[in-house]
Amino acid sequence: LNDLNVSPPELTVHVGDSALMGCVFQSTEDKCIFKIDWTLSPGEHAKDEYVLYYYSNLSVPIGRFQNRVHLMGDILCNDGSLLLQDVQEADQGTYICEIRLKGESQVFKKAVVLHVLPEEPKELMVHVGGLIQMGCVFQSTEVKHVTKVEWIFSGRRAKEEIVFRYYHKLRMSVEYSQSWGHFQNRVNLVGDIFRNDGSIMLQGVRESDGGNYTCSIHLGNLVFKKTIVLHVSPEEPRTLVTPAALRPLVLGGNQL
C-alpha cells in the first residue's frame, strides 16, 4: 500500500495561504481508518517533524502546527486529507501521510511535496479606467468540485456588495456565474474553476472601486477565503497595472 515510490504530487503556495494535501486510498474491504499520522520531512538534514495524528476520534495537531492543521477528509470514507492554513516558509518539505486500518499490519503511505513562495502582495494598485486581475487560488492535490465562488466588496462608503458569484450544483449539473450591482458587465472569471482558481478580472475601473475584495471558494463544506485591498489612483494612461509593492515610477510632465 505504499505510494511513496511514485513521484508525489507537488503543491506550490504563497506564505499565508492554505494548502489541502490529499491522502485518500481505495480499499476493496469495508475496513475503516483506524489511525492517521502526518509527518513533515523538511530535507536538508533537518529532523522530521510530527504534524498531526488521529485515533479513536481524537485528532491532535502537534507543536507549531497547532491551530493550523485539520483533517478535512471523510475519515469514514478512507480520506485522511490534511488542510494546512497560514502556510509559513518553514512548512516547506515533503508531507507523509500514513493510514492504518484496524486489524491490518499494512500501512498506506502517501507523500505530498509542498513548495512555499514569498507572500503575495495583499494590496494592488490600478488607475481609473484600467483593468486589474485579482487572484484567488486554493491549492489542493485533490480534484474537488468547486461548488461556489463568491467575491464581496466593501468600500469606504458603500456597505458590503456582491461583486461576482459562481455556482455549480452537482446534482443538477447547473453552472452559472454572474456579476452584480455596479460591477455588472465589468467582472469576468479568468481562473480555471476546475483547478480551484476563482481569479477575476475587473475592467473599466472606477474610483469608487477602491476598497477590500474578499474571495471565498467553497468546496463542499470547505471554504477558502482571501482578501485583497485595491487602491485606485486618478487616470494615468502611461503606467501599467502593478502590485502596490512594485509601483512604477511616475514621470513628471517634462520627463520622457
Epitope: D37, S56, L58, S59, P61, I62, Q66, G103
Partner: antibody
Framework: DVQLVESGAELVRPGASKLSCKAL????????MHWVKQTPVHGLEWIGI????????VYNQKFKGKATLTADKSSSTAYMELSSLTSEDSTVYYC????????????????WGAG | VLTQSPASLAASVGETVTITCRAS??????LAWYQQKQGKSPQLLIY???SLEDGVPSRFSGSGSGTQYSLKINSMQPEDTATYFC?????????FGAGTKLEL
C-alpha cells in the same frame, strides 16, 4: 527535570473530588495526559486521556460518567474530577504522560506522577 | 485483553527470568513493559515490544510479535525485585496485564 506533581491524599465525603496533576519542565500542550487507576483487585486500569493542546478527550467506557478530564494551559495542570464517590473509588490514581516514539501506534507512558 | 504469566515467581541473583504476555488479538508490536517497585509509580522499561528505554540496564530485553510477547531479565539483580506489567497501546481502551510479582 520533567515531573508530574499530583495533589496529595484526600479524605472526602461521598460526592465528588477533583484531583490535580501539575506538569513541570516540558511543554504541557505537546503531550497527552492520561489517568490510570490502581487497585489490588483490578490492577492498573486506564481511565482516559486529555490532550491539553487540542482539548480532545477519550474515555474508557467503564469510567464514562465517573471521571471528567480537563486541563488548564495557563497553569500547565491537568485535572480529573470523580463523581458519585463510593468506598470503591478509594485507591491510588496516577497521571502519566505519553511520549511519541515514531508513530501513533507507539506511544508509551514515560513519566508518571507519584500517585 | 492481556493475559500475563506467571502471577508471581522467585529468582536467585544471576538467574535468567522470563515473563510472558498474551494478547487476545494481534497488537502489532504495540506493547510496553513497566516495572513497579513497592510504593512507587510504574517505570517504563521496554516500548515497541523490543526497544529499550533510555537509562534502563541492558539485562532487560523484550521480544515477540502478533499476540505473544515476553520480557527477559538476564542475570537477576536484587534491585529487580518488583512487579512487572505489560501494556498494549494498539487501541483504546489501553489495557494492562494483571502483573507479575518478582521476588528474590
Amino acid at each position: 527535570d520533567v515531573q508530574l506533581v499530583e495533589s496529595g491524599a484526600e479524605l472526602v465525603r461521598p460526592g465528588a473530588s477533583k484531583l490535580s496533576c501539575k506538569a513541570l519542565a516540558y511543554t504541557f500542550t505537546d503531550y497527552e495526559m492520561h489517568w490510570v487507576k490502581q487497585t489490588p483487585v483490578h490492577g492498573l486500569e486506564w481511565i482516559g486521556i486529555i490532550h491539553p493542546g487540542s482539548g480532545g478527550t477519550v474515555y474508557n467506557q467503564k469510567f464514562k460518567g465517573k471521571a471528567t478530564l480537563t486541563a488548564d494551559k495557563s497553569s500547565s495542570t491537568a485535572y480529573m474530577e470523580l463523581s458519585s464517590l463510593t468506598s470503591e473509588d478509594s485507591t491510588v490514581y496516577y497521571c502519566t504522560r505519553r511520549r511519541y516514539y515514531g508513530s501513533s501506534y507507539n506511544w508509551y507512558f514515560d513519566v508518571w506522577g507519584a500517585g | 485483553v492481556l493475559t500475563q504469566s506467571p502471577a508471581s515467581l522467585a529468582a536467585s541473583v544471576g538467574e535468567t527470568v522470563t515473563i510472558t504476555c498474551r494478547a487476545s488479538e494481534n497488537i502489532y508490536y504495540s506493547l510496553a513493559w513497566y516495572q513497579q517497585k513497592q510504593g512507587k509509580s510504574p517505570q517504563l522499561l521496554i516500548y515497541n515490544a523490543n526497544s529499550l528505554e533510555d537509562g534502563v540496564p541492558s539485562r532487560f530485553s523484550g521480544s515477540g510479535s502478533g499476540t505473544q510477547y515476553s520480557l527477559k531479565i538476564n542475570s537477576m539483580q536484587p534491585e529487580d525485585t518488583a512487579t512487572y506489567f505489560c501494556e498494549q497501546t494498539y487501541d483504546v481502551p489501553l489495557t494492562f496485564g494483571a502483573g507479575t510479582k518478582l521476588e528474590l
